[in-house]
Structures are given as structure tokens and as C-alpha cells.
């Protein structure tokens, strides 16, 4: 599932190349392992912002699929309460390209620990 999430992120990156979306997104670029689920939640919430701002059907479907895949992969530990983690709004705002690169990094963390 996580490998498919990375495929979806690459697809989103390709799709937004042709668009001019100036959004800055809350981005966790240095994820601590004890906060990875919280960070993943922030990434997924921000991904929905990309979908809504783009107004593009393909991006919308890909984001929705990515959320479904991530949900299923995290169904066993998605409700773990992680303490001492940053709120999404406390994270640094970065452009979409940097956001997607950081997203791939956190997904790779999940792949490495699964």
C-alpha cells in the first residue's frame, strides 16, 4: 500500500506541473519517528487543500485514493495518541514541490518500519 501511495504522490507532482498553484502548505520536513502518525495526518489534510485549490478531477481522484490507501495502511495504529508533536499549524509553510518531497520521505519511513 505505501508503495502505491508514493506512486500517487508522483502522479500528483506530474499533474500539478502544468498548473500554477501558488499555495504554501504546512510541511513537516524533519519527522521524528514518535510523531510520524501525527505528521502523516497533517500531510493528508494539506493534500486535500491541493485537491480543492486545483479543481482538477484527476488530482481529486488521486488524492482520495491516496487517503484511502493511507487509512488502510494505518488502520491498526491510526488512532495512536502521540504526545509532544507539533500541531499542523505550527509547521513551516513550504511550496508544493517541497511539500511533496517531504511527503515521500515520511512515506518511506512507514515503508522502512513495516
Amino acid at each position: 500500500n505505501w508503495v502505491n501511495v508514493i506512486s500517487d504522490l508522483k502522479k500528483i507532482e506530474d499533474l500539478i506541473q502544468s498548473m500554477h498553484i501558488d499555495a504554501t502548505l504546512y510541511t513537516e520536513s524533519d519527522v521524528h519517528p514518535s510523531c510520524k502518525v501525527t505528521a502523516m495526518k497533517c500531510f493528508l489534510l494539506e493534500l486535500q487543500v491541493i485537491s480543492l485549490e486545483s479543481g482538477d478531477a484527476s488530482i481529486h481522484d488521486t488524492v482520495e485514493n491516496l487517503i484511502i490507501l493511507a487509512n488502510n495502511s494505518l488502520s491498526s495504529n491510526g488512532n495512536v495518541t502521540e504526545s509532544g508533536c507539533k500541531e499542523c499549524e505550527e509547521l513551516e509553510e513550504k511550496n508544493i514541490k517541497e511539500f511533496l518531497q517531504s511527503f515521500v520521505h515520511i512515506v518511506q519511513m512507514f515503508i522502512n518500519t513495516s
Partner: antibody, heavy 122, light 112 residues
Framework: EVRLMASGGGLVQPGGSLRLSCAAS????????MSWVRQAPGKGLEWVAT????????YYPDSVKGRFTISRDNSKNTLYLQMNSLRAEDTAVYYC???????????????WGQGTLVTVSS | DVVMTQSPLSLPVTLGQPASISCRSS???????????LEWFQQRPGQSPRLLIY???NRFSGVPDRFSGSGSGTDFTLKISRVEAEDVGVYYC?????????FGQGTKLEIK
Amino acid sequence: EVRLMASGGGLVQPGGSLRLSCAASEFTFSNYAMSWVRQAPGKGLEWVATISRGGDYTYYPDSVKGRFTISRDNSKNTLYLQMNSLRAEDTAVYYCARRVSMITGGWAMDYWGQGTLVTVSS
Amino acid sequence: DVVMTQSPLSLPVTLGQPASISCRSSQSIVDITGNTYLEWFQQRPGQSPRLLIYKVFNRFSGVPDRFSGSGSGTDFTLKISRVEAEDVGVYYCFQDSFVPYTFGQGTKLEIK
């Protein structure tokens, strides 16, 4: 008023195939994910398949995975369910349903068609 | 898979009296983004299912306000404040937080 009309049901032998259709009207079909749900005679509801708005992504339970294929033709406002290798336990009324988007805050099957009966028997 | 368990399976109610149906999931159905995708459907005899409640407590358009949904995590409830004759049928809870999406077994509401 949203309209969904399922058709294509009938009697088929075990191992056979059938294709169901669901004609949609009175809404912008391409803006919605769609699902199929079935109900065996006298039994409860079972989710069968879901397809994304553009048709690129599909989801199934293990009970039908590899045998059933959900697809759509947005130019014809029509949803399909191709059912292969049918078994007696696939006998049911099949309903098509419209899905509200997860991203716009819903993610629920808000409107349902009237259903079409599939009977698998020799 | 998430198993949805409803109780009671049969619910005889006097007209005008309240009714309550419970639905319990085998694991939390709060998804990673914090949403709980729990719906309630009504199926009247001989009819297609009809959406009543989505995301635990949101009433769908056209649904009378005597229907309400509540709950969180793994425990959910559908309440009818005053049962009317047209409420007869089977009620299903449904989770679509995690694939495969799953229904409860159904609760048959009948008039005493």
C-alpha cells in the same frame, strides 16, 4: 431529482457472466464516485465495489475481487458491473449508489437506484 | 476487516414512543484525518435503502429531525424520538473509513 436506474439482471448459470448497467440522470455524473451494493434474498446489505469519479481507481471486498469489475462511461452517464465466474452466493438484488466526495466533506452513498435481481442457478 | 455489530436485531416499538439502535465496530473507525465515516440507512419494505445520517450525526437532506445519530470511536447510536408508522423497516449502520466497507446486520423496526 437524482435518478439511478439499474438494469441487466437475470438468471445465469454458475460459472457464467453478466454485465449490469446503471443509468444516471439529473446530476453531473462525472463529479461523483459510484458504488454497487448487493442484498441476497432476505439478507442484509453487502458493499461490492466503488469507482472514482474518473474511473482510474476501483475498490472491492475480497468476496468479489478478481471476479467482478466496476467501470464507468462518463460520456454516457453510465456505471457498469461486469460479473464473471458467478456463484450461487452471488444471487442478490444489486443496487447502484452515488457517492459524495471524501474531500468535500461527505463520503456517503447519498442516492440509490431501484436494484436489479441477479439469480445464479443451474 | 471491520465488523459492525448492531443491536437489537428486532425492535418492536409503540407508535409515538422513542427507539434506539446501537452499532459497535470491532475497531475504531476514526480515520487518519480525524473523520469518522459512519452512516445509517433505512430500508422500508420492498424499497431501496435510503441515507439517513452520515459522518455519525449529520442528517441528510429531507430526513425528519426525529432521526438523530451520535457516538464516537467504536460505539454509535441511531435514535428516533417518536416512532411513526412510516418508520417501519430495517436500519443498517455502515462504515466506510476503511476498505472493505462494511454494514451491520440490520435492525428490523416494527410497530407493536
